[in-house]
Amino acid sequence: AEEQLEGGLRTAKDGPAAAKAAVRFHFRTSKGPEREGCYLSVGHSQPLEDCSFNMTAKTFFIIHGWTMSGMLENWLHKLVSALQMREKDANVVVVDWLPLAHQLYTDAVNSTRVVGLSVAKMLDWLQGKDGFSLGNVHLIGYSLGAHVAGFAGNFVKGTVGRITGLDPAGPMFEGVDIHRRLSPDDADFVDVLHTYTRSFGISIGIQMPVGHIDIYPNGGDFQPGCGLNDVLGSIAYGTIAEVVKCEHERAVHLFVDSLVNQDKPSFAFQCTDSNRFKKGICLSCRKNRCNGIGYNAKKTRNKRNTKMYLKTRAGMPFRVYHYQMKIHFFSYKSVGAIEPTFYVTLYGTNAESQVLSLEIVEQIGLNATNTFLVYTEEDLGDLLKIKLTWEGTSRSWYDLWREFRSYLSQPHRPERELSIRRIRVKSGETQRRLTFCVEDPEKTSIAPGQELWFYKCRDGWRMKNETSPTVELS
């Protein structure tokens, strides 16, 4: 059946002619008010002159995704403004393919290739102009737009400088071969932010890595500030759709944040999976294992489909400060499997943190070193001391009786007591390593409901210092 689009346009299935009519290139000049006439068209040089297109400057193409509303959404205008503010001489072009995107999702997917071809033809034409270089082109695509950018990069004659995929769409792209989705082959540097990946239901964002570096903020799934309770506060009804939009669109806002909050850059750390990152294992910057996110991401050699992780705040600025904590729990008797709840408070030269929970990803290893990830929203400065609390309530009579019996048979230490001599801390952002020791080496034990204080006793862990992200990425 021949399907008609609103406004009488045919779908992309009817070929490039239809796409040509359905794709517009709106050149957003920062020179004065927005001019309606600044639409670029292959073969028409006048708009380039009229609207002061700078051939030697960076050129950004912003590509929206599938839309139910049929209108350009607010995020796009914010992104345009942020780019213009950060790169004052740059050209910013909005690829408007609304007539093809404002369809059933599946039909919009089937139009992505032909829209990508349309973008490639625009780039091919611009390459014929003096001073224009594909190396200066940065395609930024959100959701379906990320795959459009991929197709454009694939079809263009030459290699585009950079493609940023902002939560590339998942349905109909997950698991397909590289020629049918965004891939590292589509530009000299492809960086991707994944903010809505789900293993249950349908994953709106693609789960698989599709770039040179693939960054998964907060594990790529539950974004802070996007829970049903959070969206309930801002709308009449907190619905799943609001959560989906919040989490999917978070990729855009993280990118905008990287443009406007230059003084608060966020860093991501290479890791094989989210669980290992949650354990605090992956906070290294050696061998390019950390990178800036969003606009501040840097191309590193020989990286492809590299997964990177970070935690973020619930809103702008999104930056947090990551710390790896290594704690060796000594247990003087067999206490079986215990599941303690520990909290830490970090005290620094600038501020003290909130009470932070130590997330136990698997199980506490007794008589073993356990690694934890904690993060703070504020810059604490140089760490001075740490308070560790073992959450616990007053025990039942049965617990007390068991403890008393245990004491009779082994009158040394109560059951469910652990000993901790030191805490080793590494800052993700500065890569500094510090060791914190108990004040009195004789008083190292902690039981439920108790706290233990640790004071900085050594710079480093008696290990070679690593480079910090600020040094590496400057």
């Epitope: 609103e6 139910m68 509303s69 599946t106 349908i202 709308i235 009449a236 619905t239 759709a241 989906v244």
Partner: antibody, heavy 119, light 107 residues
């Protein structure tokens, strides 16, 4: 919780028109598309079209584009379907249902409105 | 338009049985296949979306599978409340189309 409340049964004469309503509650009305589906007695389901209150966007099944007209009143959170030039072929139960984006499924359905066309 | 075919229009089974209902599309629908249950009182409910994803509140005895053009719905342990008519629907392209339905009865 999400609810779609449809208007009551209608007995109409051939050649006349009828307007069915579907009142939505329990979610942000402008965020979801409402679809209409026809079921003739003892038969299968036929998709009529959709209405998206967020931008008044409408899509029709080619088969129904001269039969059905979809509109909405945002203030009352209600979507309407008007059926014109009724014949006995239009005698059926008409359902409204809410579209789930990306999955292209109809997650919540109204209880249905029976339309009987008879002289 | 994409044709959806449910070859079995009626099916008898005993309580506790494992029941499978099939559905075929006239072309590849990329897993955009949904299953609905219509109860005897006419109430329609979504059971499975996107081939295999269970809609919230649907018992885990319902499951879906398939790819390309062939899909199926399985009820692992038939209960009395499952007696109903089951429809498949493709959401791959407009117009959306439904299968003719499979009426499930007790033996």
């Amino acid at each position: 919780q999400v609810q779609l409340q449809q208007s009551g049964a209608e007995l109409v004469k051939p050649g006349a028109s009828v307007r069915l309503s579907c009142k939505a509650s329990g979610y942000t009305f402008t965020k979801y598309t409402i679809h209409w589906v026809k079921q003739r007695s003892g038969q299968g389901l036929e998709w009529i079209g959709w209405f998206y209150p967020g931008s008044d966007s409408i899509k029709y099944n080619e088969k129904f584009k001269d039969k059905a007209t979809l509109t909405a009143d945002k203030s009352s959170r209600t979507v309407y379907m008007e059926l014109s030039r009724l014949t006995s072929e239009d005698s059926a139960v008409y359902f409204c249902a809410r579209h789930e984006e990306y999955t292209n499924s109809l997650a919540y359905w109204g209880q249905g409105t029976l339309v009987t066309v008879s002289a | 338009d994409i044709q959806m075919t449910q070859t079995t229009s009626s099916l008898s089974a005993s309580l506790g049985d494992r029941v499978t209902i099939s559905c075929r599309a006239s072309q590849d629908i990329s897993n955009y296949l949904n299953w609905y249950q219509q109860q005897p009182d006419g109430t329609v409910k979504l059971l499975i979306y996107y081939t295999s994803r269970l809609h919230s509140g649907v018992p885990s005895r319902f499951s879906g599978s398939g790819s390309g053009t062939d899909y199926s719905l399985t009820i692992s342990n038939l209960e009395q409340e499952d007696i109903a008519t089951y429809f498949c629907q493709q959401g791959y392209t407009l117009p959306w189309t439904f299968g003719g339905g499979t009426n499930l009865e007790i033996k």
